[in-house]
C-alpha cells in the first residue's frame, strides 16, 4: 500500500490529489484525470485541502448554552461562535466554542483585578490589609474607615467589612 | 485536423455584455468537455470556466462567477460564453479549447474582448 | 488554490544548447500538470500532459518529469523555432485549473 504526500489521499492503490478548501471530492482522480472537485453546499463547509465525498455541516451557536454567532459559516471555514455578554467559554475547540459559563463574580474580600471577557472569566485579587470589598464587580478595594478623635472603633475592619465607629 | 474559430469578440463599455461563440469541426464535438481561457494583453494564461461534454457540471473561475455564463449546444458543434458586467480588468484574449477535464489539447486563434469607456 | 511558480522567468540561450524550465505547486499536483509552448500571436499548444508524456506530434527533444510539487521540462538541443514562452499548467485538483506565470526562452 502506498503512502501518500502530503495533500494527497489514498483512492485504492493510487494517490490522488486532495480538493481545495471550500471544496469536496465529486470524481476522485484517473489514469488520466486529476481530482474533480465541487463547491460546499450551503451550511456546509471543509477549512482544510481534503479528500473528503462531502462537506462538513456547519456549527450551530447554541443560545442555551449561552453561545451566540460571532462570524457566519462559509465554504471554507465553520461558524464561529461566542459567548453572550457575561460568559465566558469554557470547552474551546480551535476557534469553536462549545460551552459558555457565567462570569465569576468576585467575593466579599476580592475585588476584579481582570474583567472577564467572552474568552475568559473574571480573575480576583484579595484586598489588601486596610482595605476591604463588598465583592461583586468591584474594582478597587475601598480603604477603611478612620474613626475620628470623637468616635471609638467598635470593630476594626476585614478585608470585607469596614470598619465600625461609634459617637460615644 | 481539429479546428476551433472563436468570435463575437470588440469593444465594449465597462459594464456591458458580450457572447463569445466557438465553432467547433472535424472532431465529435458532443464527446469533449470545452473549456474557455483568457490572455490579458502581455500577461499569462487565466482559465476562465469548463464544461462537460453533456453539460452536467461547470465550473467558474472566482473572478468570473456570477457574472459569465459557458453553454454550448452539440447539435450546433457550439461553445458559448455569454458575458455580463464587464470590467476594465476583462479585457484578453479569449480561447476556446478541447479536452479532457482540465486539460487542453487543441485550441483556437483566440478572440480580443476590449472593457474600455 | 495551487499556486505553480515558474522558474526562470527568462532563460536566455543559443540553439543547440539544453534548456530546462523548472514549475513549483505549491502543494501536491500528483502526476497531472501539463506544459504548454506558446509563440508570439499564436494560441499555446500542449506540449506534455501527466507530467511526462509528450502529446501528439511534439518532437522527443521535449521532455517533462517530476511528481508532486517539482517538475522539469527540458528541451535537449533548442532549435530556432523553439523560442517562445512556455507555461506549465496543473489539472491535479479542480477547480480552479490554474497556470504558472511563464518562463520565456529568448535567443542569447
Known amino acids: 500500500q502506498p503512502s501518500c504526500r502530503q495533500e494527497e489521499f489514498l483512492v485504492g492503490d493510487e494517490c490522488c490529489p486532495m480538493c481545495n478548501p471550500g471544496y469536496h471530492v465529486k470524481q476522485v482522480c484517473s489514469e488520466h484525470t486529476g481530482t474533480v472537485c465541487a463547491p460546499c453546499p450551503p451550511q456546509t463547509y471543509t477549512a482544510h485541502a481534503n479528500g473528503l465525498s462531502k462537506c462538513l455541516p456547519c456549527g450551530v451557536c447554541d443560545p442555551d448554552m449561552g453561545l451566540l454567532t460571532w462570524q457566519e459559516c462559509s465554504s471554507w471555514k465553520d461558524t464561529v461562535c461566542r459567548c453572550i455578554p457575561g460568559y465566558f467559554c469554557e470547552n474551546q475547540d480551535g476557534s469553536h466554542c462549545s460551552t459558555c459559563l457565567q462570569h465569576t463574580t468576585c467575593p466579599p474580600g476580592q475585588r476584579v483585578e481582570k474583567r472577564g471577557t467572552h474568552d475568559q472569566d473574571t480573575v480576583c485579587a484579595d484586598c489588601l490589609t486596610g482595605t476591604f470589598s463588598l465583592g461583586g464587580t468591584q474594582e478597587e478595594c475601598l480603604p477603611w474607615t478612620n474613626c475620628s478623635a470623637f468616635q471609638q472603633e467598635v470593630r476594626r475592619g476585614t478585608n470585607s467589612t469596614d470598619t465600625t465607629c461609634s459617637s460615644q | 485536423e481539429v479546428q476551433l474559430l472563436e468570435s463575437g469578440g470588440g469593444l465594449v463599455q465597462p459594464g456591458g455584455s458580450l457572447r463569445l461563440s466557438c465553432a467547433a469541426s472535424e472532431f465529435t464535438f458532443s464527446s469533449y468537455a470545452m473549456h474557455w481561457v483568457r490572455q490579458a494583453p502581455g500577461k499569462g494564461l487565466e482559465w476562465v470556466s469548463s464544461i462537460t461534454s453533456a453539460s452536467s457540471y461547470i465550473d467558474y473561475a472566482d473572478s468570473v462567477k456570477g457574472r459569465f455564463t459557458i453553454s454550448r449546444d452539440n447539435s450546433k458543434n457550439t461553445l458559448y460564453l455569454q458575458m455580463n458586467s464587464l470590467r476594465a480588468e476583462d479585457t484578453a484574449v479569449y480561447y476556446c479549447a478541447r479536452g479532457t477535464r482540465g486539460l487542453f489539447d487543441h485550441w483556437g486563434q483566440g478572440t480580443l474582448v476590449t472593457v474600455s469607456s | 488554490e495551487i499556486v505553480l511558480t515558474q522558474s526562470p522567468g527568462t532563460l536566455s540561450l543559443s540553439p543547440g544548447e539544453r534548456a530546462t524550465l523548472s514549475c513549483r505547486a505549491s502543494r501536491s499536483v500528483g502526476k497531472y500538470l501539463a506544459w504548454y509552448q506558446q509563440k508570439p500571436g499564436q494560441a499555446p499548444r500542449l506540449l506534455i500532459y501527466?507530467?511526462?508524456n509528450r502529446a501528439s506530434g511534439i518532437p522527443d527533444r521535449f521532455s517533462g518529469s517530476g511528481s508532486g510539487t517539482d517538475f522539469t521540462l527540458t528541451i535537449s538541443r533548442l532549435e530556432p523555432e523553439d523560442f517562445a514562452v512556455y507555461y506549465c499548467?496543473?489539472?491535479?485538483?479542480?477547480?480552479?485549473?490554474?497556470f504558472g506565470q511563464g518562463t520565456k526562452v529568448e535567443i542569447k
Open positions: 501527466l507530467g511526462s
Open positions: 499548467q496543473q489539472y491535479g485538483s479542480s477547480p480552479p485549473i490554474t
